[in-house]
């Protein structure tokens, strides 16, 4: 009995034409939604003039359907038992699952001003930039619609910059009609214990963003894992959103629509400072903002974002050190709402439910050459938005799963 099940599973989780895994892998049958909460700044003038704490008020959810497009350019390589593909990006607004429309306005940090002052630290360049910021009537903060903030707008200040810079700015610009990858993953034909594990990303085994082992591309993309998952395992996966590999550990047994699954969570240790967790030393890339690598809970991914000072954290700075959030008022971190988890069916290794939560922040520093940043007396890691990307196996699929997998085991 058990041997037969194992044999069937091993056959069906291989990523090749004709298997159950392959069909669902090419185009997920699960509806995936990405909810956004935008941090609306309540006191822009006080911050700019007096270097006050930034008072934010989250507004959301604004919901989009995502990852509904099938993988593209799927190519099997029998020589090394891999399959390569592109994951196309697409987002469709879901008004019925949102608190407002894409035309809703928000007061947010001026992305271009904050980024330009960081990318061009030369004092004379900053004098030049200052004249263009003033000429374009730009300020430290700006009012933008949801659509502009997420998917892009033409920035008036950047439109005047004589350097060859893109004048379009947006937290996820460009997104629609783009693709993530190329990913090359093991198809599991030679060894089922390697199925879905990433061999290369964009043609490389490393990211070139981090030093040492932090730069490695580890594990799968978290949509599935090799079968026969044990509770004692540390599940490694790579997330291009955060420009790094990370891991999840077992937390609890969960019953999902009659299917027994293991809930794996991203532990606080993964976000710890090198002082608390020496393994994280290579994720600390600079000494000043990180207070000599003692700060925790934020990840500087500027190297992955063309030098723009983007910092990734958990929503509301969950698991972050007090110094990170001391300049921001209005945050309420909550483990239940703001942590990331994966519900994995252990026999197949399939992720049947997940909630990926992350926050995108931008660093803004005082600049004595840029008028609108001149009065700042400290650095701010400014929360722009947080997102909750969720997917749950549909009722029909769950029924099929119960009958074909868990039912047979039990």
């Amino acid at each position: 009995g058990d041997m037969l099940i194992q044999k069937t599973i091993k056959k069906e989780v291989v990523l090749e034409e004709g298997t159950i895994a392959f069909k669902n892998w090419v185009k997920t049958g699960t509806e995936i939604y990405r909810q956004f909460w935008i941090f609306d700044v309540q006191n822009p003038q006080e911050v700019m003039m007096n270097s006050s704490n930034i008072q934010v008020k989250q507004r959301g959810p604004y919901t989009y359907r995502v990852r509904f497009l099938a993988k593209e350019n799927i190519t099997q390589d029998p020589k090394d038992n891999t399959v390569s593909f592109l994951q196309p990006n697409g987002a469709i607004f879901e008004p019925s699952l949102s608190v407002g429309t894409e035309a809703d306005n928000f007061t947010v940090l001026n992305l271009a001003v904050a980024a330009a002052s960081h990318i061009y630290p030369n004092p004379f360049v900053q004098v030049v930039l200052n004249s263009l910021i003033n000429k374009s009537k730009s300020s430290m903060f700006q009012v933008r619609t949801l659509r502009e903030l997420l998917w892009g707008y033409t920035d008036p200040f950047l439109s005047l910059v004589p350097y060859p810079v893109s004048t379009r700015v947006g937290m996820f610009y460009p997104y629609n009609n783009t693709a993530d990858g190329v990913y090359k993953v093991f198809n599991g034909k030679d060894s089922i214990s390697k199925v879905a594990i990433i061999d290369t990303y964009k043609g490389k085994r490393n990211l070139s963003y981090w030093e040492s082992y932090c730069d490695m591309i580890n594990g799968t993309d978290a949509a599935s894992f090799p079968p026969f998952v044990e509770k004692s395992q540390v599940l490694q996966f790579f997330s291009s959103d955060i420009c790094r590999s990370i891991y999840a550990v077992f937390e609890s047994d969960v019953n999902l629509k009659g299917i027994p699954v293991y809930r794996f969570v991203l532990p606080s240790k993964a976000f710890a400072s090198p002082v608390q967790n020496p393994d994280n030393h290579c994720f600390c890339t600079e000494k000043i903002i990180s207070k000599n690598c003692t700060s925790y809970g934020v990840l500087d991914i500027s190297k992955c974002k063309e030098g723009k000072p983007v910092y990734i954290s958990l929503p509301h700075f969950l698991y972050a050190s007090p110094d990170v959030s001391e300049t921001i008022d209005g945050l309420n971190p909550n483990e239940e709402e703001h942590r990331t988890y994966l519900d994995i069916e252990p026999i197949t290794g399939f992720t049947l439910q997940f909630a990926k939560r992350l926050q995108v922040n931008l660093l803004v520093k005082p600049s004595n050459k840029i008028q609108v940043l001149k009065r700042l007396k400290r650095n701010y890691i400014v929360p722009i938005l947080w997102l909750n990307e969720t997917g749950t196996i549909g009722d029909e699929k769950a029924k099929m799963f119960r009958s074909q997998v868990t039912g047979k085991i039990n």
């Epitope: 004092p123 360049v125 004098v127 004595n368 001149k374």
Partner: antibody
């Protein structure tokens, strides 16, 4: 030590052009912008403009746009300024200057010795 | 463009006296004012940079103060070697602009 060596004095006809040089030594040339400053005899100083020596991006004082053209030659660590359609108003000493970036910025911390341009028929 | 008005145009002072030169700007430039000394036949020399910062190697008898639009440059005990032209420069915005200069002579 930082040195900016400028080319020698020029006597030029009205309507003609002149190109002067400023050779830098004692530092990495492409790490700093090069500024140019005009001083008419017995008069004050005027900022003409500056050039980013690493990518040749220029920033001009509007007053000198069309009059001055700034260029660089990275291989010889030399900055150039060409002045065109010369008139008697262009008779002056022209300086190249470089900043110093430390804990605070020192604008025009290093100067060349100046190039005297005399416009006369 | 920020206009810089420097006064006086010339100044005749006795050795050991206190010298005061003033620059007023047409716009608020915070503390982005610089002061230069120029002796005949030489390029200008930076004495004081933004934020009233005395440059290394410059004697402490030279100082400056001011913020916003009103700036003062001071020589506490004038020496004969201080005979020169003095210029202020605003570096807050482009184009950088100089004051018209002050000629300091010995009385």
């Amino acid at each position: 030590q930082v040195q900016l060596q400028q080319s020698g004095a020029e006597l030029v006809m009205p309507g003609a052009s002149v190109k002067m040089s400023c050779k830098a030594s004692g530092y990495t040339f492409t790490d700093y912008w090069m500024h140019w400053v005009k001083q008419r005899p017995g008069q004050g100083l005027e900022w003409i403009g500056a050039i980013d020596t690493s990518d040749s991006y220029t920033s001009y004082n509007q007053k000198f746009k069309g009059k001055a053209t700034l260029t660089v030659d990275e291989s010889s660590s030399t900055a150039y300024m060409q002045l065109s359609s010369l008139t008697s108003e262009d008779s002056a000493v022209y300086y190249c200057a470089r900043d110093y970036y430390g804990s605070s910025t020192a604008w025009f911390a290093y100067w060349g010795q100046g190039t005297l341009v005399t416009v006369s028929a | 463009e920020t206009t810089v008005t420097q006064s006086p145009a010339s100044l005749s002072m006795a050795i050991g006296e206190k010298v005061t030169i003033r620059c007023i700007t047409s716009t608020d430039i915070d503390d982005d004012m610089n002061w230069y000394q120029q002796k005949p036949g030489e390029p200008p020399k930076l004495l004081i940079s933004e934020g009233n910062t005395l440059r290394p190697g410059v004697p402490s008898r030279f100082s400056s103060s001011g913020y916003g639009t009103d700036f003062v440059f001071t020589i506490d005990n004038m020496l004969s070697e201080d005979v020169a032209d003095y210029y202020c420069l605003q570096s807050d915005n482009l184009p950088f602009t100089f004051g018209s200069g002050t000629k300091l002579e010995i009385k």
